[in-house]
């Protein structure tokens, strides 16, 4: 948020940028939370996303029996490791085909025991408020598919007739991590010292991080003819003075007619 300044007063403005604003030669460049000529005003809404996609990571272990472990497989930059990675990835892409959330696999470690493959299965889905359910379902299908393939693709008489064969009992799901998206937490963090006064409200399933100074929401503060301004003690109404009236009160709803004051009378409406 930027406000441009022209003329002789600009040099003075430069040293007066507030709230961490920086002078760029023309104007105060304000940090995210502030705006105004001197970055003196607090914004009334903060963009908190949501992210376009949400990811999940499943830590799995499978035992490949159709490949004998060799020392070279410990070295991730060896040709042997690269070839194993390629074949394993191709095999897993076949196993998990049909899972729209499936992104790929990432081998973290290969160790002895035929070849024990510690790896992550990566999942991703478009953000919707139901993303947790979508990813929970996908992780269940991953478990089903890997269990099925490691039961079916097995060595017979020490020979494998598939791209890879597995040890049925060597399949384990260690851990499942879903990227947490917490709009309330994000809102509080991004509002910094004003966090107590910003809340999340939903519109068309999209979260909005707003202060009561943002109009059009259930928490919005009605300042009538005044202006809502955020301070460290919360939202306050700054009341205006017109040619004919002074306005006062917490929501600037009390108007005092100037002519009556000058005539030493008070009239409220």
């Amino acid at each position: 948020r930027t406000t441009t300044c022209f003329g002789d007063g600009c040099q003075n403005t430069a040293s007066r940028c507030k709230n961490g604003g920086t002078w760029d030669g023309l104007k105060c460049q304000c940090p995210n939370l502030y705006y105004g000529e001197l970055c003196e005003e607090v914004v009334s809404s903060i963009d908190i996303g949501p992210p376009e996609t949400i990811s999940a990571q499943m830590e799995l272990t499978v035992t490949v029996t159709s490949v004998k472990f060799t020392e070279e497989l410990k070295n991730h930059s060896s040709q042997e490791f690269q070839e194993f990675k390629q074949t394993f990835t191709e095999q897993m892409n076949i196993v998990y085909s049909g899972i729209p959330e499936y992104v790929g696999v990432n081998i973290t470690k290969l160790r002895l025991g035929s070849v024990v493959v510690e790896h992550d299965v990566l999942l991703r889905t478009k953000y919707t408020p139901e993303y947790k359910t979508v990813l929970d379902n996908a992780t269940e299908v991953v478990k089903e598919k890997i269990t099925k393939v490691t039961t079916q693709q097995i060595m017979i008489n020490d020979i494998c007739s598939d791209m890879m064969c597995f040890n049925t009992t060597g399949t384990q799901v260690q851990n499942i991590t879903v990227t947490q998206y917490d709009p309330e937490e994000d809102c509080r963090k991004m509002a910094k010292e004003y966090g107590d006064y910003f809340v999340v409200e939903y519109r068309d399933q999209k979260p909005y991080c707003i202060s009561p100074c943002e109009p059009g929401f259930s928490v919005s503060k009605n300042c009538n003819l005044g202006k809502c301004q955020m301070s460290l003690s919360g939202p306050q109404c700054l009341c205006v003075t017109t040619e004919t009236h002074w306005y006062s009160g917490e929501t600037c709803n009390q108007g005092t007619q100037k002519s009556l004051v000058y005539g030493h009378h008070h009239h409220h409406h």
């Epitope: 159709s66 490949v67 070839e83 020979i159 791209m163 890879m164």
Partner: nanobody, 123 residues
Framework: DVQLQASGGGSVQSGGSLRLSCAAS????????MAWFRQAPGREREGVAF???????SYAESVKGRFTISRDNALSTLWLQMNSLKPEDTGMYYC?????????????????WGQGTQVTVSS
């Protein structure tokens, strides 16, 4: 870069013999697995035999006792000695290799391939 060159194919009468060879360049000959596959017209490529770096061998049931796979690590060469050939052995024969110690006869597990050499067995 690994390159495989198969040769030795030809036409032979039923009961005859052929010796196929496969020269490997850029392949660490003392490691991994080398194999022979074949493909008859209109059929899938099938594993014939493979040999590991330690000399362990395995054969398809249909060729056991008739075919012998061997490799010379010093010469980086793979061979397939085929005896008592039958008309059903007819097809294009390919050599394949993997840097891994494999125990599979599935073609998808082998990343390196030579061009084929044709074997025709007539009755």
């Amino acid at each position: 870069d690994v390159q495989l060159q198969a040769s030795g194919g030809g036409s032979v009468q039923s009961g005859g013999s052929l010796r196929l060879s496969c020269a490997a360049s850029g392949f660490p000959s003392s490691r991994g697995t080398m194999a022979w596959f074949r493909q008859a017209p209109g059929r899938e490529r099938e594993g014939v035999a493979f040999i590991n770096s330690d000399g362990r061998t395995s054969y398809a049931e249909s060729v056991k006792g008739r075919f012998t796979i061997s490799r010379d690590n010093a010469l980086s060469t793979l061979w397939l000695q085929m005896n008592s050939l039958k008309p059903e052995d007819t097809g294009m024969y390919y050599c394949a290799a993997s840097l891994l110690y494999l125990m599979t006869v599935n073609a998808a597990a082998y990343p390196y391939w030579g061009q084929g050499t044709q074997v025709t067995v007539s009755s």
